[in-house]
């Protein structure tokens, strides 16, 4: 994966929040859980109340990448997705808000996300190679693709 | 059906160890974390401790470091708590409850057991 | 800490009536409040949850509502069986404090 300092010298400015409160379910429908107060999982849900409710703020690139940069906070608090390594279980950071600028290390807290028809894909913006996964009984962590499933479907309006 | 049952009530002497045991069934084990919870005689629900059940580690309350120790079986989806130097001061009935986040953000008890009384009387 | 502050301590109404706990958080909570109930002798049971949401199995007469750091929890009709004590508890942070109960007895 590529280092942090590959990216250090971007810098991304907070734009605003683009979605509030939406459900994401990977491509074996299994909605993405919060088992802990530091990691996510994946599980088949009968209770979608049990799912993580996700805001999704957007962030411009001073180098006018035509990406759409992301950060991915769980709605009514203050914990953020940050990337770890391949195969290491994405965090929850908790920060007193929304980071306005954002450059160097800091890059594992946001994602390009991109979409194909109904899928869609979080790339690590600290690892560009490696997306969002879930993991067969293992926590949502970064992968560059199978086994691991990298595809998710966003479900929006479900209070 | 969720099931979370316990171990059987026991009776000890101060200074004695009590180990209580509770086996989950109906949900995917490590996919939830465990509690906890105390309640001596006529008090409030005390929150001793939470239980990691894909790593086994634990979150004690400050009440609660020292004599407790919290461990697991997830091969058989168990959660155990041990109390060592018993003092009449431990008698209380102790619950084990699994921990859910609704929304991701929402912290709730869901399912609990039916309690285990520990006695300690010389 | 959170501090959850429930009241009243006791209270004692009729079959039939309408009934009303509230719980009050030291700070904003975000709607994490729930509401259990334990009958004597019993083990406790989630009612409630996320301030307003009815657990699997739970009868409709109970409801919840509230914002920042009030709430209240109601039994529309009291029936017999719900003679127990009720608790709050706050979900938003640790340790995710329970408040000291209310027993409801039957006049």
């Known amino acids: 994966s590529a280092p942090f300092s590959f990216l250090s010298n971007v810098k991304y400015n907070f734009m605003r929040i683009i979605k509030y409160e939406f459900i994401l379910n990977d491509a074996l429908n299994q909605s993405i859980i919060r088992a802990n107060d530091q990691y996510l999982t994946a599980a088949a849900l009968h209770n979608l109340d049990e799912a993580v409710k996700f805001d999704m703020g957007a962030y411009k690139s001073s180098k006018d990448d035509a990406k759409i940069t992301v950060i991915l906070r769980i709605s009514k608090t203050q914990l953020y997705v940050t990337a770890q390594d391949e195969d290491q279980p994405v965090l929850l950071k908790e920060m007193p808000e929304i980071p306005k600028t954002i450059t160097g290390s800091e890059t594992n807290l946001l994602f390009f996300w991109e979409t194909h028809g109904t899928k869609n894909y979080f790339t690590s913006v600290a690892h560009p190679n490696l997306f969002i996964a879930t993991k067969q009984d293992y926590w949502v962590c970064l992968a560059g693709g199978p086994p691991s499933i990298t595809d998710f479907q966003i479900l929006e309006n479900q209070a | 059906e969720i099931q979370l049952v316990q171990s059987g009530s026991e009776l000890k002497k101060p200074g004695a160890s009590v180990k209580v045991s509770c086996k989950a069934s109906?949900?995917?084990?490590?996919?939830?974390?465990m509690n906890w919870v105390r309640q001596a005689p006529g008090q409030d629900l005390e929150r001793m401790a939470w239980?990691?059940?894909?790593?086994?580690?634990?979150t004690y309350a400050d009440d609660f470091k020292g004599r407790f120790v919290f461990s697991l079986d997830t091969s058989v989806s168990t959660a155990y708590l041990q109390i060592s130097s018993l003092k009449a001061e431990d008698t209380a009935v102790y619950f084990c409850?699994?921990?859910?986040?609704?929304?991701?953000?929402?912290?709730?008890?869901?399912?609990w057991g039916q309690g285990t009384t520990v006695t300690v009387s010389s | 800490d959170i501090q959850m502050t429930q009241s009243p301590s006791s209270l004692s109404a009729s079959v039939g009536d309408r009934v009303t706990i509230t719980c009050r958080a030291s700070?904003?909570?975000?709607?994490?409040l729930n509401w259990y109930q334990q009958k004597p002798g019993k083990t406790p049971k989630l009612l409630i949850y996320?301030?307003?949401r009815l657990h699997s199995g739970v009868p409709s007469r109970f409801s919840g509502s509230g914002s920042g750091t009030d709430y209240t929890f109601t039994i529309s009709s009291l029936q017999p069986e719900d003679i127990a004590t009720y608790f709050c508890?706050?979900?938003?942070?640790?340790?995710?404090?329970f408040g000291q109960g209310t027993k409801l007895e039957i006049k």
């Open positions: 109906g949900y995917t084990f490590t996919n939830y974390g």
């Open positions: 508890q706050q979900g938003k942070t640790l340790p995710y404090a």
């Open positions: 409850a699994r921990g859910i986040y609704y929304y991701g953000s929402s912290y709730a008890m869901d399912y």
């Open positions: 996320y301030t307003s």
């Open positions: 700070q904003d909570i975000s709607n994490c």
């Open positions: 239980i990691n059940t894909y790593t086994g580690e634990s």
